[in-house]
């Protein structure tokens, strides 16, 4: 039994890091493998993560972590019974994938303005709370070409757009994702999308 693709890990910088790897053949990850991990400076016995299958030869493990700080470094040992298959380390702050924003809501009752709001996925005491910026994707269900991205580079989790920038009388969907420049993170997954019917009063034309 050998590791074909070494474990790579990403952290949500809060409580979970996810490690994925591939074996050289079909493997029952949960019965055959164990990923041991420990925060180096604690000098205590490692914790055990039981991996799950992720495709025939792929495995994934969700490492439970505590609050993360930038200096944290974890040791990782991948075992098959008594055989050490791979040894490595992981610094969560260097491999951050933020949590997806939640509770995306479209408020349509504000005088021809669309107000989109969502929730920051981190608690205020987490470092990323004040460092997230967002991308909002709005698209038409009727017209695949009507697809737009709005970059929200301020901290407030909201976006205002004029309803008239979208077509009237049709349905739109929106979703939002986050990233943090400070840690050069990857983008989060998209939030669940939300749907609304866009309608606004055309301005009265005077002749």
């Amino acid at each position: 039994m050998k590791v074909l693709q070494e474990p790579t890990c990403v952290s949500d910088y809060m409580s979970i890091s996810t490690c994925e790897w591939k074996m050289n053949g079909p493997t029952n990850c949960s019965t055959e493998l164990r990923l041991l991990y420990q925060l180096v400076f604690l000098l205590s016995e490692a914790h055990t993560c039981i991996p799950e299958n992720n495709g025939g030869a792929g495995c994934v493990c969700h490492l439970l972590m505590d609050d993360v700080v930038s200096a944290d470094n974890y040791t990782l040992d991948l075992w098959a019974g008594q055989q050490l298959l791979w040894k490595g380390s992981f610094k969560p702050s260097e491999h951050v994938k933020p949590r997806a924003p939640g509770n995306l809501t479209v408020h349509t009752n504000v005088s021809d303005t669309l107000l989109l709001t969502w929730s920051n996925p981190y608690p205020p005491d987490n470092y990323l709370y004040n460092h997230l910026t967002y991308a909002v994707n709005i698209w038409s269900e009727n017209d695949p070409a009507d697809f737009r991205i709005y970059n929200v580079t301020y901290l407030e989790p909201s976006l205002r757009i004029a309803a008239s920038t979208l077509k009237s009388g049709i349905s739109y969907r929106a979703r939002v994702r986050a990233w943090a420049q400070c840690y050069n993170t990857t983008w989060s997954e998209w939030s669940p999308s939300t749907k609304w019917h866009n309608s606004y009063r055309e301005p009265f034309e005077q002749h």
Epitope: F41, L42, L43, E45, D66, D67, A71
Partner: antibody, heavy 119, light 107 residues
Framework: QVQLVESGGGVVQPGRSLRLSCAAS????????MHWVRQAPGKGLEWVAV????????YYADSVKGRFTISRDNSKNTLYLQMNSLRAEDTAVYYC????????????WGQGTLVTVSS | EIVMTQSPSSLSASLGDRVTITCRAS??????LAWYQQKPGKAPKLLIY???SLESGVPSRFSGSGSGTEFTLTISSLQPDDFATYYC?????????FGQGTKLEIK
């Protein structure tokens, strides 16, 4: 419940040696790093040394490096501090403390043993 | 080494007073901070761990807050048993470090 009981303190002359022990119970001793912390009379708390769960890694405060040795016997659930070349400034109450397996854990300390270095 | 700066070093207060002690870390330690109470001749007693978690059996008038580099211990209403010395401690490295202590005295 977690219990840590220090022993081995006493009065010793400068330059002499002393060995402190810490008997642990109520938890899986072999899973935890263990620390020594001291407090000179009327002063604050000072970290002294730590040993990893399996004894493979040891770290010391600069003030005791080269003179003190931390060790453990996991079969006896006991932590030790061998103190050589003792100085007057080593006079303190010495506490053993359990480390953490997660930074969300609770820290436990013993009641301490007094070491007096005096001629 | 992570340096912990605690203030004030001493404090006089009256029964029923609200008291706040602060602790500043020289670098980000997340929430890896504990607060202890110590009385003469006794071992330090853990009050707060993980910056804001109240240790079992500790009265709810004690509370901790903060994360990163700035932390506070608050006693909402001083009781006779609270006059003691208080220490903060970081455990964000294998070498623990402590604040210098705050001696809380009766006014």
């Amino acid at each position: 419940q977690v219990q840590l009981v220090e022993s081995g303190g006493g009065v010793v002359q400068p330059g002499r040696s002393l060995r402190l022990s810490c008997a642990a119970s109520g938890f899986t001793f072999s899973s935890y790093a263990m620390h020594w912390v001291r407090q000179a009379p009327g002063k604050g708390l000072e970290w002294v040394a730590v040993i990893s769960y399996d004894g493979s890694n040891k770290y010391y405060a600069d003030s005791v490096k080269g003179r003190f040795t931390i060790s453990r016997d996991n079969s006896k659930n006991t932590l030790y501090l061998q103190m050589n070349s003792l100085r007057a400034e080593d006079t303190a109450v010495y506490y053993c403390a359990r480390g953490l397996t997660t930074v969300r854990g609770v820290l436990y300390w013993g009641q301490g043993t007094l070491v007096t270095v005096s001629s | 080494e992570i340096v912990m700066t605690q203030s004030p070093s001493s404090l006089s207060a009256s029964l029923g007073d609200r008291v706040t002690i602060t602790c500043r870390a020289s670098q980000n330690i997340g929430s890896r901070l504990a607060w202890y109470q110590q009385k003469p001749g006794k071992a330090p007693k853990l009050l707060i761990y993980k910056a804001s978690s109240l240790e079992s059996g500790v009265p709810s008038r004690f509370s901790g807050s903060g994360s990163g580099t700035e932390f506070t211990l608050t006693i909402s209403s001083l009781q006779p048993d609270d006059f003691a010395t208080y220490y903060c401690q970081q455990y964000n490295s294998y070498s623990w470090t402590f604040g210098q202590g705050t001696k809380l005295e009766i006014k």
